[in-house]
């Protein structure tokens, strides 16, 4: 849908970066503007397929919102649509452009196109430091200090505030107490313990908006521990037929974890073996020996069998830990509103699945002795 | 804090089938590994088998044949039954969590095989 | 089966000296997953070190592990009066899981 006469539309541009990422484009427009953000390749060179995000989540096409590869155009803006926008590859998720976005009262007048000036406005908060506030969760061991921070801004300057799972957090909640260090949009806990466990939520606000941010902490009482996944990944994706597809599991174990990469299937029609348990097959398995490893899967040249549902597992001698998640896979006609969507994170299983292996697939692999874990299987 | 506790018979007969079972508190046995461990009168350590929350199991080659490790999840307990028992199956039991290497342990129960 | 020994059988030392305790392993143990127990009398073992050289929570700085391979060492930098009793490796790399037959640290 074009914009409408009453409607202007301004446009802010940002090249592709070289290895770096990007330095965040600090943008403003006026209330009822077209927002139009665009992220061009220098020389025009291909980026691959991409995806628009506002402030780490997914945007989903609207009636409202616009989104083509290297173009993203939201109309008539209101506050609630500033904040930190990317662009992100597709499969790799890296960060093609970073745009800071705040929306002013006064409609802008599409001179600003440098940015410079746009200090002065008033506008709702914003990320300072998006790139600072990826780690999500915070794996530490009983009695380290911990620190979560927020940088942002705004005008007037924002005020920040903290929840713990979704309820006002104080000092005398807990036993240490905590340090708000207001100047460094931070909350610091010193000397964890297991009751510190949970997400905390910064809500940064001022008159014109609201932003927050939530960080999951485990507090590890003890080592050694069973693995821990970060929280929403691997994320459900949904592909078009043909395109590569990455997935990221994210794991934390200080015992040498077991790492794989499984997906359901059927055999001889059933999903599920003589005992009901599921079977799944290897797709990729190693050992890691670091405390945290990002685990990745790629799936090249996707086909309609290709979809369904996978888990990534880690396996250490203490447990398990698994997370389930879908791949769908679309023909080329796929509404692209689709594709845009960021879907609801999988269900967990707590039971094993049955392993299965292309040679045999009636065969059963049992879960998971440290033996198991030097006969590796790669399919 | 997770403890363990090991229940059951202290003596058992001959060629009679030895039953213990462990008892998990301050955690869910669910997605963990759980061991049963035994040390004989000369304090050799031995690593009998374990079991995953879901059921599936692993045992030492050289009592295969005579030993099942079950999981009851609702309850929050495994077992251990070896059948068979002779003199030589007198040891201190002992329940744990883990798959091999072991963390937590309960105190023991000693099983004497005698007639 | 993989066997390992332990050395010596029992270490005669004062308080306040290092301790060196050798657990060798018939065939090679990877990725380290060797760990080594204390066991001190009437208790069940506790878990000292797992993964070759990383220490459970819990348990004082003064107790280390190292090695790899074949040859692991648990190494206690200053003992004092609560060491003097029986330590244990074990291999977890390949079933079944077995135990060496032990040191016991006696008061010189």
């Known amino acids: 849908e074009p914009p409408g006469p009453e409607q202007r539309v301004v446009r802010r541009a940002a090249e592709v970066p070289g290895p770096e990422p990007s330095q965040q484009e600090q943008v403003a427009f006026g209330s009822g503007d077209t927002v139009e953000l665009s992220c061009h390749p220098p020389g025009g060179a291909p980026t691959g397929p991409t995806v628009w995000a506002k402030d780490g989540t997914g945007l989903v096409a609207s009636h409202r919102i616009l989104v083509g590869p290297q173009r993203l155009q939201v109309l008539n803006a209101s506050h609630e649509d500033a904040g930190v926008y990317s662009c992100q590859h597709r499969l790799t998720r890296r960060v093609l452009c970073h745009f800071s976005v705040r929306v002013t009262d006064a409609p802008s007048s599409g001179d600003d196109e440098d940015g410079e000036d746009v200090a002065e406005d008033t506008g709702a908060p914003y990320w300072t430091r998006p790139e600072r506030m990826d780690k999500k969760l915070l794996a530490v061991p009983a009695a380290n200090t911990v620190r979560f921070r927020c940088p942002a801004a705004g005008n007037p300057t924002p005020s920040i505030s903290w929840l713990k799972n979704g309820k006002e957090f104080r000092g005398e909640h807990r036993i240490g107490g905590i340090k708000l260090r207001h100047q460094q949009w931070s909350l610091v806990m010193e000397s964890v313990v297991p009751s510190d466990r949970g997400n905390y939520t910064c809500v940064v606000e001022n008159k014109f908006g609201s932003i927050r941010q939530t960080y999951t902490l485990d507090v590890l009482e003890r080592s050694p521990h069973r693995p821990i996944l970060q929280a929403g990944l691997p994320a459900n994706q949904t592909a078009i037929l043909g395109s590569d597809v990455e997935f990221h599991c994210k794991v934390y174990s200080d015992a040498q974890p077991h790492i794989q990469w499984l997906k359901h299937v059927e055999v001889n029609g059933s999903k599920v073996g003589p005992d009901g348990t599921p079977y799944v097959t290897v797709l990729k398995s190693w050992i890691s020996e670091n405390v945290e490893a990002d685990a990745r899967l790629r799936l090249a040249n996707v086909s309609e069998r290709d979809g369904g549902e996978y888990l990534c597992r880690a396996t250490n001698f203490i447990g398990v830990a698994e997370k389930a998640f879908w791949l769908r896979v679309h023909g080329p006609q796929a509404a692209e509103e689709e594709l845009m969507e960021t879907d609801e994170a999988g269900s967990v299983y707590a039971g094993e699945q049955k392993l299965i292996s292309e040679e045999d697939l009636g065969g059963e692999q049992k879960l998971i002795s440290e033996e198991d874990l030097h006969h590796h299987h790669h399919h | 804090q997770v403890q363990l506790q090991e229940s059951g018979p202290g003596l058992v007969k001959p060629s009679e089938t030895l039953s213990l079972t462990c008892t998990v508190s301050?955690?869910?046995?669910?997605?963990?590994?759980w061991s049963w461990i035994r040390q004989l009168p000369g304090k050799e350590l031995e690593w009998i088998g374990h079991i995953y929350s879901s059921g599936s199991t692993r045992y030492n080659p050289s009592l295969q044949s005579r030993v099942t490790i079950s999981i009851d999840t609702s309850k929050n307990q495994f077992s251990l039954k070896l059948s068979s028992v002779t003199a030589a199956d007198t040891a201190v039991y002992y329940c744990?969590?883990?798959?091999?290497?072991?963390?937590?342990w309960g105190q023991g129960t000693l099983v004497t095989v005698s007639s | 089966e993989i066997v390992l020994t332990q050395s010596p059988g029992t270490l005669s030392l004062s308080p306040g000296e290092r301790a060196t305790l050798s657990c060798r392993t018939s065939q090679s143990i990877s990725s380290g997953y060797l760990a080594w127990y204390q066991q001190k009398p009437g208790q069940a073992p506790r878990l000292l070190i797992y993964?070759?050289?990383r220490r459970a929570t819990g348990i004082p700085d003064r107790f280390s592990g190292s090695g790899s391979g074949t040859d692991f060492t648990l190494t206690i930098s200053r003992l004092e009066p609560e060491d003097f009793v029986v330590y244990y490796c074990q291999q977890y790399g390949s079933s079944p899981y077995t135990f060496g037959q032990g040191t016991k640290l006696e008061i010189k």
């Open positions: 301050g955690d869910s046995i669910n997605s963990y590994f």
């Open positions: 744990a969590r883990g798959a091999s290497a072991v963390d937590y």
């Open positions: 993964g070759a050289s």
